[in-house]
């Protein structure tokens, strides 16, 4: 099943997020992703846990997953590079870099997103945008078109309360509020964008969605700048 959903959001403006990627397994949407360089898409490591021998591809320039669109391009993956410290049973280091088989043709609907390199927490309350093709309600309806939602960043201390994530949120992770509006498993690997800059990647750990006591968890890309640079080099 696809990992992730946007809850309480709305359909995104078509092609207004040209960095948005759909990571696909055997032709079906699996996870979100974000184009960070001409030949590289950043996603979540857990996304490929169940991929085994399946064919992994990346769809760029898409709004609708099913409809033909002038800007849609499907790229094969040359290699998948999960973070070396990612593990199946934890949400830590949940990052994956996918090298496309060729450089993406950049244009109005396909552009890399600048990512945060300054390792500083985003101010609590900052409104950030998260987008994805994940399930849109608890009944499991999957959208065909890209959805998005604006979420305020939640401070780490609150997120780490016993009633919330009970100390699991390290300095390399960040949280966003989850009161009915939320990202969830199916949006894993997708971007959390604050002020036009990629700040976080949706983690793919299993958690309840849309419950304010269980905020959304995002991997802070700035904390992994050295690793990202070393892989892209």
């Amino acid at each position: 099943p696809p990992r992730g959903r946007i809850l309480g959001g709305r359909e995104a403006e078509a092609h207004a997020r040209p960095y948005m990627a759909s990571v696909q397994l055997n032709g079906a949407h699996l996870c979100g992703g974000v184009l960070v360089a001409e030949q590289w898409v950043l996603s979540a490591a857990h996304c490929l846990e169940d991929a085994a021998d399946g064919k992994v591809q990346v769809l760029l320039g898409a709004h609708s997953l099913s409809q033909p669109e002038p800007s849609k391009r499907l790229y094969d993956v040359l290699r998948a590079v999960p973070h070396p410290d990612s593990q199946p049973d934890t949400i830590d280091h949940d990052l994956l870099l996918l090298q496309l088989s060729e450089k993406a043709t950049l244009g109005p609907a396909v552009r890399p997103l600048p990512w945060q390199r300054v390792d500083r927490d985003v101010a609590p309350g900052t409104l950030c945008d998260v987008a994805g093709w994940g399930i849109v309600n608890h009944a499991g309806r999957r959208p065909d078109s890209l959805q998005h939602v604006l979420l305020p960043v939640l401070d780490r201390a609150t997120c780490n309360r016993r009633t919330h994530h009970d100390g699991a949120i390290t300095e390399r992770l960040m949280c966003a509020e989850s009161n009915r509006r939320d990202s969830c498993k199916g949006d894993s690997g997708g971007p959390l964008v604050c002020g036009g800059v990629l700040e976080g990647v949706v983690t793919s750990g299993s958690r309840v969605c849309g419950n304010r006591k269980k905020p959304g968890i995002y991997t802070r890309v700035a904390s992994y700048a050295a690793w990202i640079d070393s892989v892209l080099a």
Epitope: A14, H15, P18, P68, E69, P70, S71, T105, L106, G107, P108, A109, R111
Partner: antibody, heavy 118, light 107 residues
Framework: QVQLQQPGTELVKPGASVKLPCKAS????????MQWVKQRPGQGLEWIGE????????NYNQKFKGKATLTVDTSSTTAYMQLSSLTSEDSAVYYC???????????WGQGTTLTVSS | DIQMTQTTSSLSVSLGDRVTISCRAS??????LNWYQQKPDGTVKLLIY???RLHSGVPSRFSGSGSGTDYSLTISNLEPEDIATYYC?????????FGGGTKLEIK
């Protein structure tokens, strides 16, 4: 309404450079790419390159690298194409065109006729 | 570079005719094809994008079709204002390339 204004004619000497403007109005300039296209007298259309005014990322036709330089001035919502070391081969009509997410140019300027002559 | 060939450079037509203009790509361009109209005064307009999609404001007498390497533009009932040169253009692979154009001329 969307308008792309280009001067009608430019006359320059061989070896010189020229900077052709394309003044955009009626839309948010930084939200759309701009393409440039060449048409020699009696000939077809030839794609030169395209620029994203929001961050000046450019795709060039390799054939025009070193000949054409694309720039923008967002404050005046104007795109420019500079052509250098001009020869008679550069005499042509040059069009600017707004390039959109449908991967086509939906509005075109009237074109500037460049004449390179001593 | 992908070569786009419009074998018919000029076509003698009559008003009311059904006119079909062909375009062939040197390799499969998977429907990444647009059609433009250039009037005798130099004005250029987008007619069809993505092989068959009519651009807004373009009369429904214009239609596009094709796949793989072979594409066509059809004008179902030629009007006086359709006298122009028509160009196909691929955007499958950089650099984007145009066909040589097909000029419609009244018989």
């Amino acid at each position: 309404q969307v308008q792309l204004q280009q001067p009608g004619t430019e006359l320059v000497k061989p070896g010189a450079s020229v900077k052709l403007p394309c003044k955009a109005s009626g839309y948010t300039f930084t939200s759309y790419w701009m393409q440039w296209v060449k048409q020699r007298p009696g000939q077809g259309l030839e794609w030169i390159g395209e620029i994203d005014p929001s961050d000046t990322y450019i795709n060039y036709n390799q054939k025009f690298k070193g000949k054409a330089t694309l720039t923008v001035d967002t404050s005046s919502t104007t795109a420019y194409m500079q052509l250098s070391s001009l020869t008679s081969e550069d005499s042509a009509v040059y069009y600017c065109a707004r390039y959109t997410t449908i991967m086509a140019s939906d509005y075109w300027g009237q074109g500037t006729t460049l004449t390179v002559s001593s | 570079d992908i070569q786009m060939t419009q074998t018919t450079s000029s076509l003698s037509v009559s008003l009311g005719d059904r006119v079909t203009i062909s375009c062939r790509a040197s390799q499969d361009i998977t429907n990444y094809l647009n059609w433009y109209q250039q009037k005798p005064d130099g004005t250029v307009k987008l007619l069809i994008y993505f092989t068959s999609r009519l651009h807004s404001g373009v009369p429904s007498r214009f239609s596009g079709s094709g796949s793989g390497t072979d594409y066509s533009l059809t004008i179902s009932n030629l009007e006086p204002e359709d006298i122009a040169t028509y160009y196909c253009q691929q955007y499958s692979k950089l650099p984007w390339t145009f066909g040589g154009g097909t000029k419609l001329e009244i018989k």
